[in-house]
Amino acid sequence: VPQKPKVSLNPPWNRIFKGENVTLTCNGNNFFEVSSTKWFHNGSLSEETNSSLNIVNAKFEDSGEYKCQHQQVNESEPVYLEVFSDWLLLQASAEVVMEGQPLFLRCHGWRNWDVYKVIYYKDGEALKYWYENHNISITNATVEDSGTYYCTGKVWQLDYESEPLNITVIKAPREKYWLQ
């Protein structure tokens, strides 16, 4: 049975600033055919037929749901892209994470400007501070890492705060063993 294809992002953030670039790639098993990919944005078929969809100089209209399909195989699960205009943007490797998987958070400055005195907050409480910009990199996420995160920092000597982001860590499905 052919597997569903999967959409991946490069860079891996599904929240980006207006004007930035991102490439969506449709990964699947044994898809070697040229021009065999269908891309759907908010349900509408895109003109792109390559296995990669390049979004250059992102606009607000590029926000929304993306799915891909190889030949007659099932559509991929949707990926949601959101385009922002702000001073700070909290980016996450994933917003729903399986327990035991890594979780990476980044406090991204508009136009890649330097951000200083960055603080990450979780559920309203300061979580991590450093003099300059820095990341949070959790190797093995646990359910306790679930919560609402945001970051604050200084850009050009002024204080800014990102929009909040909900992160959910879900328990890995347990294998079922039947007694013989």
């Epitope: 200083y116 005195k117 603080i119 991590k128 003099y131 949070i136 990199s137 959790i138």
Partner: antibody, heavy 120, light 112 residues
């Protein structure tokens, strides 16, 4: 109130590794960097490194890069420093210390220190 | 690494006198974020160090106002306006601006 509890002393054979503990209480353990500082007998203070319990990010003094490993156990609010292949030069008091980088200081609360003696 | 050089190594004073300790860094410790993370600690015999001054000139709460810090760039000074018996011990300057963070070698304040 904030407390950092450390064992009083550890005797270790040269070449054997030693793991020092620092149990924190009275504050949100995952929200502050934990530092390790040592002091050889009759000498000054030396910063070894720091670890952030939220994600175990570590910043180490290059002098200790190959010999000190900093870890945390969030469930017990305990920070650890493992010193591998110690020599007599490593005999010292080892402190854990917590400050508030946001407010601009690194060491406000100190453990009582663990006296490590490296001796055959 | 940034080297912190303290002077003098020993400072004999009479109670009630003013004491002044100098600390020089081998390069500027003004961080690119605009702050200078220069701290002063006092360690009494058999005790852990105690924070006195942070970010060059900010007195930590509960620290008597006879303690003051000043300086910028690479030159810093701790002044004690009227030395009291409880002030005796070893004073350390410390830079927390750039990793690896470094302490000065210490200044022992003792009775003349």
């Amino acid at each position: 109130q904030v407390q950092l509890q450390q064992p009083g002393a550890e005797l270790v054979r040269p070449g054997a590794s030693v793991k020092l503990s620092c149990k924190a209480s009275g504050y949100s353990f995952t929200s502050y960097w934990m530092n390790w500082v040592n002091q050889r007998p009759g000498q000054g203070l030396e910063w070894i490194g720091m670890i952030h319990p939220s994600d175990s990010e570590t910043r180490l003094n290059p002098n200790f890069k190959d010999r000190a490993t900093l870890t945390v156990d969030k469930s017990s609010s305990t920070a650890y420093m493992q010193l591998s292949s110690p020599t007599s030069e490593d005999s010292a008091v080892y402190y854990c210390a917590r400050g508030s980088l946001y407010d601009g200081y690194l060491f406000l609360y100190w453990g009582q220190g663990t006296l490590v003696t490296v001796s055959a | 690494d940034i080297v912190m050089t303290q002077s003098p190594l020993s400072l004999p004073v009479s109670l009630g006198d003013q004491a002044s300790i100098s600390c020089r860094s081998s390069q500027s410790i003004l961080h690119s974020n605009g702050d200078t993370y220069l701290e002063w600690y006092l360690q009494k015999p058999g005790q852990s160090p105690k924070l006195l001054i942070y970010k060059v000139s900010n007195r930590f709460s509960g620290v008597p106002d006879r303690f003051s810090g000043s300086g910028s760039g690479t030159d810093f000074t701790l002044k004690i306006s009227r030395v009291e018996a409880e002030d005796l011990g070893v004073y350390y300057c410390f830079q927390g601006s750039y990793v690896p963070f470094t302490f000065g070698s210490g200044t022992k304040l003792e009775i003349k």
